[in-house]
Interface confidence: medium
């Protein structure tokens, strides 16, 4: 059946139109041809004029920007509330993982606090910026503990006698202790767990962030004039004819949308290919991989690196009192 | 072995409960994070008919409009959608995405590639370079324990990782030690997620 | 900086092929439309082919439709021309082309141009 | 197709004087957006073309204020206000409104 004659008085048009638009200056009072028209190209007389087909592309655009945030609403609202949690859980996974081996030091060995407080309050500190992004090597941090820790271990419990600060000899320490690998393979052992369980939180957190940074990208699009264009045509240009309950067709809102949106669903494939890329990253978060059981478990592995140099205390002293004898002379006289 | 430092818990029940069959810890926080991203997989191929499942469509009328006349729902001019003569479509076509999408294409194609640099091949529970130094994978049993450590007696067994609840946040009296450092925000007594995190506008 | 490298130009017999490659850098080429423009000894410019970002839409001069053909590898970063059947006429200078960028205007909109804002050195 | 007419086809100019070419379009340029969708390329000797203007009166980046485009619909004008000797080469209009995109013959 042919549809219906517009509106004689375009007095429909008028009354929607002026919800979009306050004052009706723009609307025609009776069918005009409407040869101006660019968007909403009329068959017959027309309640559009041109101001008016502006209006409405303005309208369908933030239409079109609505409906997208509204689609991503929950996503953006998983990821954002995800990022902030793990954010947070890691911070305190550090909080207690430094908690713990400042217990360890002051039940075990309380002659190398309060020292041990600060080295290992330095470590972790440390260790939370990089998680965060901070350009630190995990290997410089966990030599600068072993470095700093040796100079006390040594001064405070292997050969107490000697000056409270003797800053020559603990340069000669620091050196001595890597070149005598004084702690054996622990540092390595700590270096390699370390690194690669925050490396594996590091990149979880940026993957997360870039999540919420992919969604509002999307979140926050322009649309292209081709497509505030068909989106017009689509949604409002059936009012110029006076049709203002009709909805458009299933087929041809499809058609527009993917018209619309063929940039954005160039997304989709890296999108995939993101989640399930995050997917086998978090399969393998255990062990060695895990942040929260490796920096945890801290504590018993720097106990047990001290516990290896007090083992080998007797031959260590020997030998460091020869290679930092010239230090400790000048120190003493 | 190392002096576990139990007896620095201010709520010593949280020790007790430590041990609930199905707590909530961090790795299965990620794990259910990881199931409802799976949910939107899809989420940007299925974006153009989520819109128009959600703005007006002709479903139950007779006739719908195809951007030029009204015209029967299933006929053929509504299949051929008016687009007929009205611009070239293939204008859209010949276009990539817009500068910001290509943009975050390429951050995307980074990620994935460090994702993928960075996941751990599956079956491989412990490096290579680990057991060389004398951390066998034997070592440690079930799933419930982790051991982490090494040399003989000095191993340890910290039991089950963190709660992820608020019982979470405990906190030890060596946190106001003299020369420990407090950085941040160190009064958390409970997990919370009401801030943003990343580039929100 | 943006670069684009022809290569593959060569001396044939007529009614053979020659397939010529346009190596790019410096941008994202997926997100572009490319173009292949010849210009023949002392003559002008000529433009003989574009092809969408994605591969999917490809248009062609008269002279050319039916034996050449435009086609890109996104993961090479490469633009190609395969050249059937060729005649005397052919011989040119091939340049590859990048399409011009995107430009916002007043009211918001992004829209897309198709001038060709970057050129390679061309292959004989 | 759409056919580009240049004029003239050489033109012999001094250093510091202005120089002006003229190139007409079969059929309008002008989009429905009020854009004339026309560019201007020089190819300067033994080298490859380059952008100098676009949508009829834009400077692509790098362009010397001393270029300018004009004109609406099918009547377009390049002019250099001062040429210069580094300004030596061939001129073509091209349009870019549908295809086959279609160059002027060249102004040298």
């Known amino acids: 059946q042919p549809p219906p004659p517009p509106d004689a008085t375009c007095h429909q048009v008028r009354s929607f139109f002026q919800r979009l638009q306050p004052g009706l200056k723009w609307v025609p009072e009776t069918p005009v041809p409407g040869s101006d028209l660019q968007v909403c190209l009329p068959k017959g007389p027309t309640c559009c004029s041109r101001k008016m087909e502006e209006k409405y592309q303005l309208t369908a655009r933030l239409n079109m920007e609505q409906l997208l945030q509204s689609a991503s609403m929950e996503l953006k609202f998983l990821i954002i509330q995800n990022a902030a949690v793990f954010q947070e859980a890691f911070e305190i996974v550090v909080r207690h993982a430094k908690n713990y081996t400042n217990a360890m030091f002051k039940n075990n060995y309380p002659s190398l606090t309060p020292q041990a407080f600060e080295f290992v309050g330095e470590f972790f500190t440390d260790v939370s910026l990089y998680i965060l992004g901070s350009d630190i090597n995990v290997d410089d941090m966990v030599n600068e503990l072993f470095d700093s820790l040796f100079p006390v271990i040594y001064t405070q419990m292997m050969n107490p006698g000697l000056p409270e600060s003797v800053l020559d000899i603990n340069e000669c320490l620091r050196g001595a202790r890597r070149d005598l690998k004084v702690f054996g393979s622990f540092p390595k052992l700590i270096m390699t767990q370390v690194s690669k369980s925050l490396q594996v939180t590091r990149i979880f957190l940026q993957a997360l962030n870039l999540g919420i940074e992919v969604i509002n990208t999307t979140d926050h699009l322009k649309f292209s004039k081709d497509c505030g264009r068909m989106l017009t045509r689509m949604w409002y240009c059936s009012y110029c004819q006076g049709l203002m309950m009709v909805k458009p067709c299933g087929g041809y809102c499809n058609v527009v949308m993917q018209g619309c949106m063929a940039g954005v669903v160039e997304i989709d494939k890296y999108w995939r290919e993101y989640i399930l890329s995050l997917e086998e990253l978090v399969n393998g978060m255990y062990r060695i991989y895990d942040m929260e059981n490796v920096l945890l478990g801290l504590f018993s592995t720097i106990h047990d690196s001290i516990q290896y140099v007090q083992k080998n205390g007797g031959k260590l002293t020997t030998t460091i009192g020869k290679l930092c004898a010239h230090s400790q002379q000048r120190q003493y006289r | 072995s190392a002096y576990y430092p139990e007896d620095l818990f201010i709520d010593k029940k949280i020790l007790k409960v430590a041990h609930v069959e199905h707590e909530e810890t961090l790795s299965s926080r990620r794990r259910e994070l990881i199931q409802k991203l799976k949910s939107f997989i899809n989420f940007y191929s299925a974006l153009p008919g989520y819109i128009c499942s959600h703005s007006p469509v002709a479903e139950n009328d007779t006739l719908c409009w195809n951007g030029q006349e009204l015209v029967e729902r299933y006929s053929q001019k509504a299949a051929r959608n008016g687009m007929k003569n009205q611009f070239n479509l293939h204008e859209l076509k010949m276009k990539g995405p817009e500068p910001v999408v290509s943009q975050i294409i390429d951050k995307l194609k980074h990620i994935n590639q460090l994702l993928r640099t960075m996941s751990v091949p599956k079956g491989k529970v412990l490096d290579k370079s680990l057991d060389e130094e004398g951390l066998e994978s034997g070592d440690c049993g079930d799933d419930e324990d982790e051991c982490i450590g090494s040399s003989g007696d000095g191993m340890v067994k910290v039991k089950n990782q963190l709660r992820f609840l608020a019982e979470l946040a405990y906190d030890l009296d060596v946190d106001d030690a003299p020369g420990n450092k407090q950085h941040g925000n160190q009064k958390d007594n409970e997990i919370t997620t009401s801030h943003s995190v990343g580039n929100m506008p | 900086q943006v670069q684009l490298q022809e290569s593959g130009g060569g001396v044939v017999q007529p009614g053979r092929s020659l397939r010529l490659s346009c190596a790019a850098s410096g941008f994202t080429f997926s997100s572009y439309a490319m173009h292949w423009v010849r210009q023949a000894p002392g003559k002008g410019l000529e433009w003989v082919a574009v092809?969408?970002?994605?591969?999917?839409?490809?248009y062609y001069a008269d002279s050319v439709k039916g034996r050449f053909t435009i086609s890109r590898d996104n993961s090479k970063n490469t633009l190609y021309l395969q050249m059937n059947s060729l005649r005397a006429e052919d011989t040119a200078v091939y340049y590859c082309?990048?399409?011009?960028?995107?430009?916002?205007?007043?009211?918001?909109?992004?829209?897309?141009?198709?001038?060709?804002?970057?050129w390679g050195q061309g292959t004989t | 197709d759409v056919v580009m007419t240049q004029s003239p086809l050489s033109l012999p100019v001094t250093p510091g004087e202005p120089a002006s070419i003229s190139c007409r379009s079969s059929q309008s340029l002008l989009d429905s957006d009020g854009y004339n969708f026309l560019d201007w390329y020089v190819q300067k000797p033994g080298q490859s073309p380059q952008r100098l203007i676009y949508?009829?009166?834009i400077r692509a980046s790098g362009v010397p204020d001393r270029f300018s485009g004009s004109g609406s619909g099918t009547d377009f004008t390049l002019k250099i206000s001062r040429v210069e000797a580094d300004d030596v080469g061939v001129y073509y209009c091209?349009?870019?409104?549908?295809?086959?995109?279609?160059f002027g013959q060249g102004t040298k």
């Open positions: 949508l009829g009166s």
């Open positions: 082309a990048k399409e011009g960028t995107y430009y916002y205007d007043s009211s918001g909109y992004w829209d897309y141009y198709y001038g060709m804002d970057v």
């Open positions: 092809i969408s970002y994605d591969g999917s839409n490809k």
């Open positions: 091209m349009q870019a409104l549908q295809t086959p995109w279609t």
